[in-house]
């Protein structure tokens, strides 16, 4: 019986686990893993904690192992080219004899500290209009940005700063499916540059 596709998120250079979740390991004969090509096959090992893995593609040599008793497969030292669709054909002693589990591996970089860029738009009656832009160093896929304490989403935040807001700290959190990181700027800094005539300010 074919299953739906299970999305697995991995971090570049780290390890990822494909959850096979075998509940009756005594009934497993062999599990064949394929992606763009054959990847590996996994067979029962005499140690119930570690099934035997035979890697069938050189790209995966010394990077794959399986965990007992559930036969979960681990790929370590992840590379961007590891991303894609994977399939585990599970051959058992019992009818229906073969079941298939499907996975999609997405690989992301662990996010570094984002940078907040400040642009002073205008200043009227001790209220200044400031735009804050938050960005991560490398352009990454699936990155979302959130600002606290305002709860705004997106990487750009427009602020009308009044003297009463001096004690606030604005924090930008960048997040992708595998990590998050934050940077902050205090409200005190935002309009302090007006007197000095600066239009932009970089934190960090």
């Amino acid at each position: 019986k074919d299953s739906e596709i299970f999305t697995v998120n991995g971090i570049l250079g780290e390890s990822v686990t494909f959850p096979v979740n075998i509940q009756e390991p005594r009934q497993v004969k062999i599990i064949a893993w394929t992606s763009k090509t054959s990847v590996a096959y996994v067979t029962p090992g005499d140690s119930e904690t570690a099934p035997v893995v035979t890697v069938t593609h050189r790209n995966y040599y010394e990077r794959i192992h399986a965990l007992g008793p559930n036969y979960n497969l681990v790929i370590s030292d992840l590379r961007m080219e590891d991303a894609g669709d994977y399939k585990a054909d599970i051959n058992t002693q019992a009818d229906p004899y073969t079941t298939t589990k499907r996975y999609n591996l997405q690989i992301y970089r662990r996010l570094g500290k984002p940078k907040i860029t400040q642009s002073l738009m205008a200043s009227v009656n001790s209220t200044c209009n400031v735009t804050l832009t938050c960005s991560v160093e490398k352009e990454e896929k699936n990155v979302t940005y959130n600002w606290s304490p305002l709860g705004e989403e997106g990487n750009v935040l427009q602020i009308f700063q009044t003297p009463e807001d001096q004690e606030l700290t604005y924090t930008c959190t960048a997040q992708n499916p595998v990590s998050n990181n934050s940077d902050s700027i205090s409200a005190r800094q935002l309009c302090a540059d007006i007197a000095m005539g600066f239009r932009t300010h970089h934190t960090g």
Partner: antibody, heavy 117, light 112 residues
Framework: QIQLVQSGPELKKPGETVKISCKAS????????MHWVKQAPGKGLKWMGW????????TYADDFKGRFAFSLETSASTAYLQINNLNNDDTATYFC??????????WGAGTTVTVSS | DVLMTQTPLSLPVSLGDQASISCRSS???????????LEWYLQKPGQSPKLLIY???NRFSGVPDRFSGSGSGTDFTLKISRVEAEDLGVYYC?????????FGGGTKLEIK
Amino acid sequence: QIQLVQSGPELKKPGETVKISCKASGYTFTTYSMHWVKQAPGKGLKWMGWIDTATGEPTYADDFKGRFAFSLETSASTAYLQINNLNNDDTATYFCVKSAYWYFDVWGAGTTVTVSS
Amino acid sequence: DVLMTQTPLSLPVSLGDQASISCRSSQSIVHINGNTYLEWYLQKPGQSPKLLIYKVSNRFSGVPDRFSGSGSGTDFTLKISRVEAEDLGVYYCFQGSHVPWTFGGGTKLEIK
């Protein structure tokens, strides 16, 4: 502690259907498979098969293919055994049994099904 | 299917005696992973079975050390070194190496 609580005894007529329940507690239900074992009066034990509690995929021993169905209500941590078109040979006590990968570690108290016209 | 044959069918013993139950499989029950999934269960009167021994010789947690299992291939034995009143009931061997998994016919341990 881990418990499997089964539903009460059933008296049925030939041709009818029975559905017995097995409610699990004390562990994460979807981690371990649930098996069913039959014991006819004064007889030994017979393994009927099992259900994967994560996927709902059943596996039946050959003698229990056709009229027998294993199912789950995961939200209630409950496994079910349904027997259709009952006949006299189905008169037995049915046990649900939790597997711990390499052995059966917990058994329900059993549900007695009597088929009589 | 693997047939599990237990002997004797009935075993009358005196309390404090040693008891020995034999279980023979119709074919080797060594699993493809090299382990032998032979278990022993005790069903006391009016109760459900309980696990005593797994993988031929491993005592399950809480099982007294007077119970021991041995054997290999197709021949297996359960020994009770000093029978106590609470040991009475029906003992079943079971193989979980080859599907369908099968139980022995049972051995009734009773007071002589």
